[in-house]
Interface confidence: medium
């Protein structure tokens, strides 16, 4: 018995071939011997089966001795053995119809779980293998779960249902809702304007929700909410903002925040959360601010950084075009009695300069000591 696999909602064509290459009488019946369709001369006749309005044939092929049964908009319950009677012969075809659906929304937050459910006919024992857009293969039976979705899981999932060494393929488009970056770090000199950007890794027609930026300054004992905002159809409106610092926010996506000036008391880490309408859970992006200050007080030239720096970062003071005078894996370095000239304070990671601040040291004219 020939086995044909079909997909719920699709169209299937079951073949039936006569030895004579001409139009002769044929009938298609189901396993209960109920007539589905057949012919009377060159006319298509239909029987009382439940497939009535969804069953068809190709009359253009009858003259070649081919009498297909076409079933449109397949349902799981269409799974059955179909019998083609032609030339006193019976050809049996077993049709198995499968459906695969994501049993939640196909737009999921990063970190959430995706569950795919297979609808299958009674008596079948299929297996499912799915390949994610990043090339991860997973397998299961009637249900298939993927926990902790990542950004790279966005895209078309290709799932293959295997039964009787035959396969049918499903494509399911999954959108993982997340920020493009989980974390970012901004390096600024004291007094410079700071731009924070929070681009989303997905696009949807309408985007509605609300968000907040909580900030933990390095110098502060607790975190505080710097800004809260609403998002309506991709338009951003500020609800509440602190007076110090007074952040400004762009009115359009991507989410964009401006801090008028970088000051040591603002250096620290922030967490932007975005709650989307009709979604449980929130999107998160961490943002870090490192601020540098170079100062000269009397005979002491000092360079300091504030904020979340990694222990491997190097802070250096050097006279322009000369070797570093001092270089340490610390957050403050200084030089006593610095030579006159343009001094550079550098924050670097494995030789790559992340932040630079210049300060001019003027010559000191000392009066000779009287004898």
């Amino acid at each position: 018995k020939k086995v044909v696999l079909g997909k719920k909602g699709d169209t299937v064509e079951l073949t039936c071939t006569a030895s004579q290459k001409k139009s002769i009488q044929f009938h298609w019946k189901n396993s209960n011997q109920i007539k589905i369709l057949g012919n009377q001369g060159s006319f298509l006749t239909k029987g009382p089966s439940k497939l009535n309005d969804r069953a068809d044939s190709r009359r253009s092929l009858w003259d070649q001795g081919n009498f297909p049964l076409i079933i449109k908009n397949l349902k799981i319950e269409d799974s059955d053995t179909y019998i083609c009677e032609v030339e006193d012969q019976k050809e049996e075809v077993q049709l198995l119809v499968f459906g695969l659906t994501a049993n939640s929304d196909t737009h999921l937050l990063q970190g959430q779980s995706l569950t795919l459910t297979l609808e299958s006919p009674p008596g079948s024992s299929p297996s499912v293998q799915c390949r994610s857009p990043r090339g991860k293969n997973i397998q299961g039976g009637k249900t298939l779960s993927v926990s902790q979705l990542e950004l790279q899981d966005s895209g078309t999932w290709t799932c293959t249902v295997l039964q009787n060494q035959k396969k049918v393929e499903f494509k399911i488009d999954i959108v993982v809702l997340a920020f493009q970056k989980a974390s970012s770090i901004v390096y600024k000199k004291e007094g410079e304007q700071v731009e924070f950007s929070f681009p989303l890794a997905f696009t949807v027609e309408k985007l509605t929700g609300s968000g907040e930026l909580w900030w933990q300054a390095e110098r502060a004992s607790s975190s505080k909410s710097w800004i809260t905002f609403d998002l309506k159809n991709k338009e951003v409106s500020v609800k509440r903002v602190t007076q110090d610092p007074k952040l400004q926010m762009g009115k359009k996506l991507p989410l964009h925040l401006t801090l008028p000036q970088a000051l040591p008391q603002y250096a620290g880490s922030g967490n932007l959360t975005l709650a989307l309408e009709a979604k449980t859970g929130k999107l998160h992006q961490e943002v870090n601010l490192v601020v540098m200050r170079a100062t000269q007080l009397q005979k002491n030239l000092t360079c300091e950084v504030w904020g979340p720096t990694s222990p491997k970062l190097m802070l250096s003071l050097k006279l322009e075009n000369k070797e570093a005078k001092v270089s340490k894996r610390e957050k403050a370095v200084w030089v006593l009695n610095p030579e006159a000239g343009m001094w550079q304070c550098l924050l670097s990671d494995s030789g790559q300069v992340l932040l630079e601040s210049n300060i001019k040291v003027l010559p000191t004219w000392s009066t000779p000591v009287q004898p």
Epitope: Q129, R131, P133, R134, G135, K136, N137, I138, Q139, T156, T158, T160, L162, Q165, K166, K167, E169, K171
Partner: antibody, heavy 118, light 108 residues
């Protein structure tokens, strides 16, 4: 008879480009995942790329952004477009068919040699 | 990336002896996604085992595969002269679909 025949190999300078082809016969090409695998002289097998029946593509980091796998089901053909070639890409390139209902490369071509040298 | 380690690097045996080849994965691989290949000099590889333990079409029953998780084994029950070759394991669990470095089975 199920068969895969690779072509398009040759000598190319570093930074150059090459397009490999694989002609398939004896089976319904569109029903199968297809792969490219390479092997440098005296070395082991290295997976280069895969294209699924739905057109989904996969690459290792070593070739991502430089190599592009594609297929033309109507022509029963598989392709590998290679740009920005390096000496390390020198190898015999095999085209292979993925299993029908299992994972494994069950039919292989005889390979085509790519040499990247100035 | 899942790294596959094969041991031993070389296995020196005589015809008629039993060969046991190991393939270890750096992280768990579902048995459905592990394959073994044989390659002889100047030839393309040949699929021996898929799904960790199923023999490919036309492969003699002296070849068998076993294992799960991170440890997989290819066994050749009685070596025939034509079995002396290099054997590779490969995982399809997640991209990149890596191969092991190979085990060479040569004549003692």
């Amino acid at each position: 008879e199920v068969q895969l025949v690779e072509s398009g190999g040759g000598l190319v300078q570093p930074g150059g480009s090459l397009r490999l082809s694989c002609a398939a016969s004896g089976f319904t090409f569109s029903n199968y995942d297809m792969h490219w695998v390479r092997q440098a002289t005296g070395k082991g097998l290295e997976w280069v790329s895969t294209i699924g029946t739905a057109g989904d593509t996969y690459y290792p980091g070593s070739v991502k952004g430089r190599f592009t796998i594609s297929r033309k089901n109507a022509k029963n053909s598989l392709y590998l477009q290679m740009i920005s070639l390096r000496a390390g890409d020198t190898a015999v390139y095999y085209c292979a068919r993925g299993g029908d209902y299992y994972y494994g490369m069950d039919v292989w071509g005889q390979g085509t040699t790519v040499t990247v040298s100035s | 990336e899942i790294v596959l380690t094969q041991s031993p690097g070389t296995l020196s045996l005589s015809p008629g002896e039993r060969a046991t080849l190991s393939c270890r994965a750096s992280q768990s691989v579902s048995s459905s996604y592990l394959a073994w290949y044989q390659q002889k000099p100047g030839q393309a590889p040949r699929l021996l085992i898929y799904g960790a333990s199923s023999r490919a079409t036309g492969i003699p029953d002296r070849f068998s595969g076993s294992g799960s998780g991170t440890d997989f084994t290819l066994t050749i029950s009685r070596l025939e002269p034509e079995d002396f070759a290099v054997y590779y394991c490969q995982q399809f669990g997640s991209s990149p679909f890596t191969f092991g470095p190979g085990t060479k089975v040569d004549i003692k």
